[in-house]
Interface confidence: low
């Protein structure tokens, strides 16, 4: 029996469509196909940023992959032909591997890029980016951000930059359609008369750093002689009921420090008669089945009873 | 992607301990509670405990307190569950789980550790 | 605790079969009843939290109903992939407790 070889692909390359991370993968087909014509080969292909533990892996019949990258490291990848069993009597035939790399050449020295790039999306409706000028750079420096995700036919400029002495050290981003549960992508890029300027690459989801507003409308409904319900309404804007947790403080005649974290807009609290005074203040975050992480809100205004009227059935600011 | 890590299988002896980890990565480590949760073979699913690496506050079943002690190590964003006193009932499938808070389900879960009691 | 008791233990069943699973509470849970589907030598997959809201990319064919104490478990329409066995979780009050599982066969 003749062993059955198959050559790794041709033409193998790493493609930067200007996305800012979001990267194609493709090749062409080997050489000397025709032995197999009867049969569509696959691909085993692995990638991964340079310096990561593990690759990813998928296995695919098509000629070309995408995904999203750290643009701070440099990409390498793999791939080699799979054919079939069915076309080699049950024996598992692979290629050798052919193999690539990409990276973007960096300018400057790393202390340029921006420092402390924070982005939040305030309330699921405004998504607000910040940062501090790199180490060291000059007041001539300047900072572009850049954005792209799926949807948008290219990378956009941000147009309402946050300034501070005439620098730019932040973007208010306008509507951002359609954009949540999906990678976000942006780029730093500096310009300096003196010096090159180091970018900087993010990737986030918006859903993941979400800052609600906090709960609104706090009330107090006697349930029985010892129990309080404490009541509050999700913050008005676009996340539905479902997706909020609370986090409640409640403090009792200024001694007591309740925390309780819970699900629902409602929490009932123990009390005794001597209760003289009763506050409470909540905040929200986005939950886990609307997002893989969040921010908390700010507390809501305070709510508090003082006196005889806690006796009576609502009690109200 | 959020992803919870296991230890490999344990064999131990009963009367001694074993402590099983979770790594956890693709999220922040200090804001979510972290369980633990075992089935026997050919058994349902029984919770043993939760952490809230944030501020090591722990929940644990009334059946398992005393016997399991969990611990988080943020700097590594692990999870450890350690079992003493094991007896042979203890051999089981042991799997951390990802909540929110104490009272969510767990969509995300370990690939579980096989802990076998043996003489 | 809250004891979660579930039936069948196993069901026998074919592809395009309606199957209902039922789950009952100790006590009242209100609607933090949660489902499960794990498959031999794997990990727990989250189909159904708080009784009927799928969660995230679980297929339509899979729905859930119930308040209180009583819960129902819905596949409208097996297919191959959903050989499995099917456990439902209290997520009401600590500790959390599970139903001892349902085994879906191939008849």
């Known amino acids: 029996d003749t062993e059955i070889k198959v050559n790794p692909p041709q033409d193998f390359e790493i493609v930067d469509p200007g996305y800012l991370g979001y990267l194609y993968l493709q090749w062409q087909p080997p050489l000397s196909l025709d032995h197999f014509k009867e049969c569509t080969v696959e691909y085993e292909l692995k990638y991964r940023n340079i310096g990561s533990e593990t690759w990813k892996t998928i296995i695919t019949k098509n000629l070309h992959y995408k995904d999203g990258f750290d643009l701070n490291k440099g990409i390498e990848a793999k791939i080699h032909t799979l054919l079939p069993w069915q076309c080699t009597n049950g024996s598992e035939v692979q290629s050798s591997w052919a193999e690539t790399t990409y990276w973007i050449s960096p300018q400057g020295i790393p202390e340029t890029k921006v420092q402390d790039m924070d982005c939040v999306y305030y309330n699921w409706q405004y998504l607000l980016c910040s940062w501090k000028p790199g180490i060291g750079v000059l007041l001539d420096t300047n900072y572009n951000l850049f954005y792209w995700y799926e949807g948008l036919d290219h990378a956009l400029q941000c147009v309402d930059y946050i300034k501070a002495d005439g620098q730019n050290i932040g973007c208010r981003f306008p509507y951002l359609e359609a954009s949540d549960y999906k990678d976000f992508y942006i780029c730093v890029n500096g310009s300096s008369e003196n010096k090159p300027i180091r970018s900087s690459y993010f990737t986030f989801q918006l859903q993941n750093i979400v800052k609600p507003l906090p709960p609104v409308y706090l009330t107090f409904t006697r349930e029985s002689s010892c129990e309080i319900k404490l009541k509050w309404s999700i913050p008005l804007g676009p996340i539905p009921a479902r997706c909020f947790d609370y986090e409640i403080e409640i403090r009792e005649d200024d001694t007591t420090l309740v925390t309780a974290t819970v699900e629902n807009e409602t929490y009932t609290l123990k009390t005794t008669n001597e209760t003289r005074q009763l506050c409470f203040v909540v905040r929200s975050k986005v939950n886990i089945y609307c997002s893989d992480d969040g921010i908390w809100s700010e507390w809501s205004d305070k709510q508090c009873w003082e006196g005889e009227d806690l006796s009576k059935k609502t009690l109200l600011r | 992607q959020v992803q919870l890590v296991q230890s490999g299988a344990e064999v131990a002896k009963p009367g001694a301990s074993v402590k099983v980890s979770c790594k956890a990565s693709?999220?922040?480590?200090?804001?979510?509670?972290t369980q633990w949760i075992r089935q026997a073979p050919g058994q349902g699913l029984e919770g043993i405990g939760a952490?809230?690496?944030?501020?090591?506050?722990?929940s644990y079943n009334q059946k398992f307190k005393g016997r399991a002690t969990l611990t988080a190590d943020k700097s590594t964003s692990t999870v450890y569950m350690q079992l003493s006193s094991l007896r042979s009932e203890d051999t089981a499938v042991y799997y951390c789980?990802?909540?929110?808070?104490?009272?969510?389900?767990?969509?995300?879960w370990g690939q579980g550790t096989l802990v076998t009691v043996s003489s | 605790d809250i004891q979660m008791t579930q039936s069948p233990s196993s069901l026998s069943t074919s592809v395009g079969d309606r199957v209902t699973i039922t789950c009952k509470a100790s006590?009242?849970?209100?609607?933090?009843v949660a489902w499960y589907q794990q498959k031999p030598g794997k990990s727990p997959k989250l189909l159904i939290y708080?009784?009927?809201y799928r969660y995230t990319g679980v297929p339509d064919r899979f729905s859930g109903s119930g308040s209180g104490t009583d819960f129902t478990f819905t596949i409208s329409s097996l297919q191959p992939e959903d050989f499995a066995t099917y456990s439902c979780?209290?997520?009401?009050?600590?500790?959390?407790?599970f139903g001892g599982g349902t085994k879906l066969e191939i008849k």
């Open positions: 006590q009242d849970v209100s609607t933090a």
């Open positions: 708080s009784a009927s």
């Open positions: 789980a990802r909540g929110a808070t104490l009272l969510r389900p767990f969509p995300y």
């Open positions: 952490i809230y690496p944030g501020d090591d506050d722990t």
């Open positions: 693709g999220y922040t480590f200090t804001s979510y509670w």
């Open positions: 979780q209290q997520h009401y009050s600590i500790p959390p407790t």
